[in-house]
């Protein structure tokens, strides 16, 4: 129920990568506007994105306060130009989002290979420790800072002349792998949080190959 010229939001969806978190919904507004509220299970509601005609609201600033909390959002619909108007029950129409726990559900962003260095038959591959929007003591934390040992990286590596992908895993941001002398290798990494049951893997990093700028070769 509600006033005849407002419709409730629907398809409320969390879109979150490395804790950058946006709530999206439908429909595109016609003669109506939206306001979003967010709360933890035990907390008070906080209003965001007041009287907007957008169908998304960036809630990053709220969820990064405690990424291990579970959040609930709701989207209120108001008639455009008459935001005091309410539904027939005396309250504006609203729709609840699914619950969202950032630590468990944020998608892992595409990682980047920072560098690789060959020393003889060993190659050290370093993954960039990406900065997140989670803050502690006024500094932004890296993905490793937030997830600690819950975060691992899988390295795929292969000879340029071959298709089979060998793998290595690390719970740091560095790999040390054995390679055949005189062979060029390509590398790609994937972030993984094994303790999760969903959203466990990131997309693969761009492929980096030996003989390109990022690497360094030293003959020992």
């Amino acid at each position: 129920s509600g006033t005849t010229n407002t419709v409730a939001a629907y398809n409320l969806t969390w879109k979150s990568t490395n804790f950058k978190t946006i709530l999206e919904w439908e429909p595109k507004p016609v003669n109506q506007v939206y306001t979003v509220q967010i709360s933890t299970k035990s907390g008070d509601w906080k209003s965001k994105c007041f009287y907007t005609t957008d169908t998304e609201c960036d809630l990053t600033d709220e969820i990064v306060k405690d990424v291990k909390q579970t959040y609930l959002a709701r989207v209120f619909s108001y008639p455009a130009g008459n935001v005091e108007s309410t539904g027939s029950a005396g309250e504006p129409l609203y729709e609840n989002s699914p619950e969202f726990t950032p630590y468990l559900e944020t998608n892992l962003g595409q990682p980047t290979i920072q560098s690789f260095e060959q020393v003889g038959t060993k190659v050290n591959v370093t993954v960039e420790d990406e900065r997140t929007l989670v803050r502690r003591n006024n500094t932004f934390l890296s993905l490793r800072d937030v997830f600690g040992k819950d975060l691992i990286y899988t390295l795929y590596y292969w000879k340029s002349s071959s298709s089979g992908k060998k793998t290595a895993k690390t719970n740091t941001n560095e790999f040390l792998i054995d390679v055949d002398k005189g062979e060029n290798y390509c590398f790609s990494v994937q972030a993984v949080i094994p303790s999760r049951t969903v959203n466990r893997k990131s997309t693969d990093s761009p492929v980096e190959c030996m003989g390109q700028e990022k690497g360094e070769f030293r003959e020992i």
């Epitope: 691992i152 060998k166 895993k169 690390t170 994937q190 693969d204």
Partner: antibody, heavy 120, light 107 residues
Framework: EVQLVESGGGLVQPGGSLRLSCAAS????????IHWVRQAPGKGLEWVGY????????YYADSVNGRFTISADTSKNTAYLQMNSLRAEDTAVYYC?????????????WGQGTLVTVSS | DIQMTQSPSSLSASVGDRVTITCRAS??????VAWYQQKPGKAPKLLIY???FLYSGVPSRFSGSRSGTDFTLTISSLQPEDFATYYC?????????FGQGTKVEIK
């Protein structure tokens, strides 16, 4: 409940082909890695190969490279082992197993196995 | 490829005995070693991961340890249901490799 069920085994002549299936339930295969491991009668375990269903990456043991192909259909939550140019020494029980994907844990769930016999 | 040399290949023991099985890796594999139990006609089951961690649901009489490239599976007090074949496996690098297996039989 996590479950892996292999099927498709049977008797095949040397030089023939066979496709094994590994149907997964209780988890999404693209979130993990799937390995195939075989065991010849009365022998130990031999790793065959793996697939990351998320990106299609694979790697094979030297003994099967070029003859066997692992693939996955994420819409069916199923992995496959296509075996071509089969030899008598490929006779074995074939298991698929889930790789937990962590730095610490390897193959945490296994299927019941399916027997492949290569004989004329 | 990394070789995992497992010993003994078989052993006879009685219920209540302490049983030790060892595996030696041909090169450093850090702690990336698992132990599996397999009974006839059945799939292997994970017992120990990361050299010394007991997998969920596995009885505490099973334990694992590491000393350099040597890995040990110990059953502190053998039970009737423990008669089986045990395999070590390294997953430090591709291809993962298994030990040859140790068959634990009733004396």
């Amino acid at each position: 409940e996590v479950q892996l069920v292999e099927s498709g085994g049977g008797l095949v002549q040397p030089g023939g082909s066979l496709r094994l299936s590994c149907a997964a339930s209780g988890f999404t295969i693209s979130d993990y890695w799937i390995h195939w491991v075989r065991q010849a009668p009365g022998k130990g375990l031999e790793w065959v190969g793996y697939i990351d269903p998320y990106n299609g990456y694979t790697y094979y043991a030297d003994s099967v490279n070029g003859r066997f192909t692992i693939s996955a259909d994420t819409s069916k939550n199923t992995a496959y082992l296509q075996m071509n140019s089969l030899r008598a020494e490929d006779t074995a029980v074939y298991y698929c197993a889930r790789d937990y994907g962590s730095y610490l844990v390897s193959l945490d769930y296994w299927g019941q196995g399916t027997l492949v016999t290569v004989s004329s | 490829d990394i070789q995992m040399t497992q010993s003994p290949s078989s052993l006879s023991a009685s219920v209540g005995d302490r049983v030790t099985i060892t595996c030696r890796a041909s090169q450093d594999v850090n702690t990336a070693v698992a132990w599996y139990q397999q009974k006839p006609g059945k799939a292997p089951k994970l017992l120990i991961y990361s050299a010394s961690f007991l997998y969920s649901g596995v009885p505490s009489r099973f334990s694992g340890s590491r000393s350099g490239t040597d890995f040990t599976l110990t059953i502190s007090s053998l039970q009737p249901e423990d008669f089986a074949t045990y395999y070590c496996q390294q997953h430090y690098t591709t291809p993962p490799t298994f030990g040859q297996g140790t068959k634990v039989e009733i004396k």
